[in-house]
Amino acid sequence: MMTGTIETTGNISAEKGGSIILQCHLSSTTAQVTQVNWEQQDQLLAICNADLGWHISPSFKDRVAPGPGLGLTLQSLTVNDTGEYFCIYHTYPDGTYTGRIFLEVLESSVAEHGARFQIPIEGRDYKDDDDKHHHHHH
């Protein structure tokens, strides 16, 4: 039974040209995290593998930095970075948990600082079924 929940930074806004930290936290489970995938819509941004370390997708190599922790730092933000981001936690023995973050990149005069809040997102909708695509779970 999957008991864990994913807490995320929720809906966040940031300034164009600035940077932002995408952060998820898995709690209420003793499952071992084996890999975390960070995705934007259907595009892979990065992988953090417990055994092998980080992989940053080449199309983001100049603008994405690993960390802090299992999080991801997006730099040199553009308006095109606005959208949904997903942290997909692969765990053993629980299976897969998915968290969602919505990022809005605004012109610097409009962006609100400190507009971060946490939305717990439960990851109980599916088990470790490799044939299912994570984005079916919003």
């Epitope: 084996t34 890999q35 995938n37 892979l44 992988i47 593998n49 055994d51 092998l52 370390g53 980080w54 992989h55 997708s57 080449p58 199309s59 190599k61 692969h90 490799d130 044939d131 695509h133």
Partner: antibody, heavy 121, light 106 residues
């Protein structure tokens, strides 16, 4: 020590089929993205296709010349990669290598010796 | 289809610096990798993710990738570096190899 051992090559007639295997050891195979690369006699390297880890969807990508004819699969419980080749053509004659995609700093390794596939009537 | 272009051959004197280029449309948006292959042997990865060296590869091998060009640089080239070198464009959807460059150490 990372090791890849390819097998299953041989002589096959045009239009025939062959299945290659690659036995992996010395690393966590299930997390690796794996590719097949071939090299025709006296020619350069040509990427055939890849399969991602199950934790990245386990999806496959193929080069245009083999798409629809070749199928890559993996058995993580056996640490083995496969390449099923159907409708073989003479131009598929090559040494076939299985390789680890260079995703992670902690997982780069040597290629195997390859297995020779000869398509001839 | 995506293509990578390498010079067929490059010559260098021992101790000098050899540079092998690889060009492709927006190659800098992908990862550039380089492989060394000596006659009768399997290829060896010498540079991955543009500029990283696998363990066991000498420091004289370095790489860069920007714009439309990736470059493999061998400083203080040695006779043992004579080989074919292949560039590779890598991303999460496809992989492409260049045609190869024969490096001759005069």
């Amino acid at each position: 020590e990372v090791q890849l051992v390819e097998s299953g090559g041989g002589l096959v007639k045009p239009g025939g089929s062959l299945r290659l295997s690659c036995a992996a050891s010395g690393f966590t195979f299930s997390y690796a993205w794996m590719s097949w690369v071939r090299q025709a006699p006296g020619k350069g390297l040509e990427w055939v296709g890849r399969i991602k880890s199950k934790t990245n969807g386990g999806t496959t990508d193929y080069a245009a010349p083999v798409k629809g004819r070749f199928t890559i699969s993996r058995d993580d419980s056996k640490d083995t990669l496969y390449l099923l080749m159907n409708s073989l053509k003479t131009e598929d004659t090559a040494v076939y290598y299985c390789t680890i995609d260079p995703l992670y700093d902690l997982l780069t390794g040597p290629w195997g010796q390859g297995t020779l596939v000869t398509v001839s009537s | 289809s995506y293509e990578l272009t390498q010079p067929p051959s490059v010559s260098v004197s021992p101790g000098q610096t050899a540079s092998i280029t690889c060009s492709g449309d927006k190659l800098g948006d992908k990862y550039g990798c380089w492989y060394q292959q000596k006659p009768g042997q399997s290829p060896i990865l010498v540079i991955y993710q543009d500029s990283k060296r696998p363990s066991g590869i000498p420091e004289r091998f370095s790489g860069s990738n920007s714009g439309n060009t990736a470059t493999l640089t061998i400083s203080g080239t040695q006779a043992m570096d004579e080989a074919d070198y292949y560039c590779q464009a890598w991303d999460s959807s496809t992989v492409v190899f260049g045609g190869g460059t024969k490096l001759t150490v005069l």
